[in-house]
Every structure is written in structure tokens, then in C-alpha cells.
């Protein structure tokens, strides 16, 4: 396993609809044709997998149908979007990139993006 640099933004604020987007960029050390991207969430020293996708270079990034993540790839950067976020989902979201094929295998883990999610205030009842 060889190490690889990964960059991602330090902080992102989710929209009022609970959507957060960020870029994950990796320093590809060679001609990888198969790449796996995983988003991990770290909160209270617990790390959980949020979503993962494997893609072939030049093809679309596809997550599972029930995934809360969507994304697009362009060269050695991936644009990730996480949906359905609530205030309790605030945490550090880490981008993990693996160059699966051809060998050698490379692994890169970003420093994480702190995503802040604020639940919208309910609209007050109007008297009309």
C-alpha cells in the first residue's frame, strides 16, 4: 500500500435544505483506471462510512440507489454532494481515495471537511 495526498476544504456549511457539497482532490501518482472514493464521518471519536463509489476513469461516479451521496468526477478531483443532512449530522467528513487498478494500490485520506448543519426554524403560524 502506497500513500497518496488528498485535499478537501476545511469547512462547509450545509444549505437550509440539508445539502452539503465539497471537492475532494487527489494527487494521482500514475495512470489509475479504477478509483474508489469513500466518505467517512468522524464524530465523538467514532468513524462511520457515509457512502462509497467505485468508478472507471472517464465514466460517471455511481453510488448505490439508496445512498445519500451523489457525485461527479473530473480528472483527479471528485465533486461530492451529501443530502438529507440534519443538525445531528454535523461532523467531520473525511474523503478517502483508493487507486484500485492497475497495481500498485494507492491509498489517500484527506484531513476532513467539517460540515455544519443547522436545522431550519419552523415557520410561525400565520393568522389570516
Amino acid at each position: 500500500c502506497k500513500a497518496m495526498h488528498v485535499a478537501q476544504p476545511a469547512v462547509v456549511l450545509a444549505s437550509s435544505r440539508g445539502i452539503a457539497s465539497f471537492v475532494c482532490e487527489y494527487a494521482s501518482p500514475g495512470k489509475a483506471t479504477e478509483v474508489r472514493v469513500t466518505v467517512l464521518r468522524q464524530a465523538d471519536s467514532q468513524v462511520t462510512e457515509v457512502c462509497a463509489a467505485t468508478y472507471m476513469m472517464g465514466n460517471e461516479l455511481t453510488f448505490l440507489d439508496d445512498s445519500i451521496c451523489t457525485g461527479t468526477s473530473s480528472g483527479n478531483q471528485v465533486n461530492l454532494t451529501i443530502q438529507g443532512l440534519r443538525a445531528m449530522d454535523t461532523g467531520l467528513y473525511i474523503c478517502k481515495v483508493e487507486l484500485m487498478y492497475p497495481p500498485p494500490y494507492y491509498l489517500g485520506i484527506g484531513n476532513g471537511t467539517q460540515i455544519y448543519v443547522i436545522d431550519p426554524e419552523p415557520c410561525p403560524d400565520s393568522d389570516f
Epitope: A7, Q8, Y26, A27, S28, K31, T33, M57, N76
Partner: nanobody, 126 residues
């Protein structure tokens, strides 16, 4: 859209040095990571070096590490490849390529670059 033009190639004796330039027009190069590649007749394109947007991140394959150095001058919209201790097997057409990125990294994979120059010939011979 950015356009790239390489220069600085030519005939050099074994053991000699050359500095190649990759000049950009049509856009500011500081938005792009830049890579240098070469292709010898009948061979696959080979990665040589890359440099991130700010110049703080560079990467080289083991084959040229220590002999080749990449640098950039964003004020001049130019990226350079300094090549030392040249050998006959360094004879090839040398290309630079650019990729618009968000952060400071770069890639050694030709698959990641979408803008390429026309190339400059380097011949190492006595």
C-alpha cells in the same frame, strides 16, 4: 480556454542540460495544475513531473527524480522543466498539459489532463 506552447527543445550532448518552457495564453495558468510528459517513437507516453497551482506541491516518478525539476512562474504564466544529466534515452517529444483544479495538488496521470501543447523535440546525441 487555455492554450499551451512548449519551447526550449533541441539537440544536446549526453550529460548536458536543457530547460523547457510551457507558456500559457487565453487564461491565467495559476488556476491550473501542469504536468510534463514525453513520448519517444513507438513508445507509450511517459509521465515526468507535475506541479500544483501554487507551486508548493510537485511530484515525480522514480525514473527521473533527481535529474528533472519542475517549477512555475505564475506572473509569467509559464511552467518550466529543468533537465540535467541528459541521456540518449531521454530523446523524445516533450509535452506539457494543464488541468483546472481547486486545491494545490497535481496528477502524474495523463488521463487527468484535458489541455495539451503541441510538443517540443528533445534529441540527446553526440
Amino acid at each position: 480556454e487555455v492554450q499551451l506552447v512548449e519551447s526550449g527543445g533541441g539537440l544536446v550532448q549526453p550529460g548536458g542540460s536543457l530547460r523547457l518552457s510551457c507558456a500559457a495564453s487565453g487564461d491565467t495558468l495559476e488556476s491550473f495544475a501542469v504536468g510534463w510528459f514525453r513520448q519517444a517513437p513507438g513508445k507509450e507516453r511517459e509521465e515526468l513531473a507535475c506541479i500544483g497551482r501554487t507551486g508548493e506541491f510537485t511530484d515525480y516518478p522514480g525514473s527521473v527524480k533527481g535529474r528533472f525539476t519542475i517549477s512555475r512562474d505564475n506572473a509569467k504564466n509559464t511552467v518550466y522543466l529543468q533537465m540535467n544529466s541528459l541521456r540518449a534515452e531521454d530523446t523524445a517529444v516533450y509535452y506539457c498539459a494543464a488541468e483546472r483544479l481547486v486545491f494545490h495538488l497535481c496528477s502524474l496521470s495523463e488521463y487527468d489532463y484535458d489541455t495539451w501543447g503541441q510538443g517540443t523535440q528533445v534529441t540527446v546525441s553526440s
